[in-house]
Interface confidence: medium
């Protein structure tokens, strides 16, 4: 499955929007820094089947969508930027869903890659727990925004590697 050219453009726009969501200087939040244990191994170039990579990418973007579409995120971040971000992620998810069905087929389920998907879900659970513990403070959101920028960049790199393998 070839992800369309618009997909990588959308990825770039999503990253720019994440950068624009910064409300405070990261330097004022150094005491709030946290290691969320990003599941790096799921994004490394281990002989990934393409279908598995796409399923993991989909989960990553879906969880990002879920994280930023809460009432708490709307209160902490710019509403219009958030909405633009949702729309970009929606288009990314649509592209990946089409690909999952071409690569995996309707019979096989992405549950085949449950371990990888579970690792991504647990990563986002740690982020959500952190936000809850920090009572969704502006510094907590800044730490999370920076973390998502980093993990989103890594997932974009995986997509680039998939494209170069075609």
């Amino acid at each position: 499955c070839d992800l369309p050219q618009t997909h990588s453009l959308g990825n770039r726009r999503a990253l720019i929007l994440l950068a624009q969501m910064r409300r405070i200087s990261p330097f004022s939040c150094l005491k709030d820094r946290h290691d969320f244990e990003f599941p790096q191994e799921e994004f490394d170039d281990k002989q990934f089947q393409k279908a598995q990579a796409i399923s993991v990418l989909h989960e990553m973007i879906q969880q990002t969508f879920n994280l930023f579409s809460t009432k708490d995120s709307s209160a902490a971040l710019d509403e219009t930027l958030l909405d633009e971000f949702y729309i970009e992620l929606d288009q990314q998810l649509n592209d990946l869903e089409s690909c999952v069905m071409q690569e995996v087929g309707v019979i096989e389920s992405p549950l085949m890659y449950e371990d990888s998907i579970l690792a991504v879900r647990k990563y986002f659970q740690r982020i959500t727990l952190y936000l809850t513990e920090k009572k969704y403070s502006s510094c907590a959101w800044e730490v999370v925004r920076a973390e998502i920028m980093r993990s989103f960049s890594l997932s974009i790199n995986l997509q680039k590697r998939l494209k170069s393998k075609e």
């Epitope: 989909h58 929606d90 288009q91 649509n94």
Partner: antibody, heavy 118, light 109 residues
Framework: QVQLKQSGPGLVQPSQSLSITCTVS????????VHWIRQSPGKGLEWLGV???????DYNAAFISRLSTTKDNSKSQFFFKMNSLQAKDTAIYYC????????????WGQGTLVTVSA | QIVLTQSPTIMSASLGERVTMTCTAS???????LHWYQQKPGSSPKLLIY???NLASGVPARFSGSGSGTSYSLTISNMEAEDAATYYC??????????FGGGTKLEIK
Amino acid sequence: QVQLKQSGPGLVQPSQSLSITCTVSGISLTSYGVHWIRQSPGKGLEWLGVIWSGGNTDYNAAFISRLSTTKDNSKSQFFFKMNSLQAKDTAIYYCARGRGNYVPFTYWGQGTLVTVSA
Amino acid sequence: QIVLTQSPTIMSASLGERVTMTCTASSSVSSTYLHWYQQKPGSSPKLLIYSTSNLASGVPARFSGSGSGTSYSLTISNMEAEDAATYYCHQYHRSPPMTFGGGTKLEIK
């Protein structure tokens, strides 16, 4: 590809109700809302309502008294019911999938042409 | 509710010609929430451009969108036969109802 398949009657008697089913197929990896939109020669595209993944609904105020939408998650089926149809309700009725409540529609049903006539 | 007025209602263009159609909102709409669809006879609408200027998957680069506030436009830089269709603008922002424009029918001259 994700597909939305609609089924429902082509002809409805005046004052009777219209029921349409929208079945979503393909791997559905996410939660989403299903919107209902109609297209009539006189009024163009008109949004009627939506049922969200959690089951809550929003309706166009002009139709709220005679419209209901429900779903069966286990069958990936979404149900649309409109009461008291009149000739002016003759239109093509579409279901469409939206992920958030302000994202555009990438996936649409094929449409159900409904004629209200005795 | 926000009313979207499209103009012209019907237009014709020669192959290779540059085509522009407009969508005017009765009150200001953020560019994030303004989308365009293409519909051919007997088919469902197809997402063409989202958030004013972003091309949906698989849409040729000859299509572009622009605008802000109450005035938006869709341009085809180089009309092709397959572009003959009706084009609708669409807005939605959180509170229902979403609305669509009346459409611009584009024919081949």
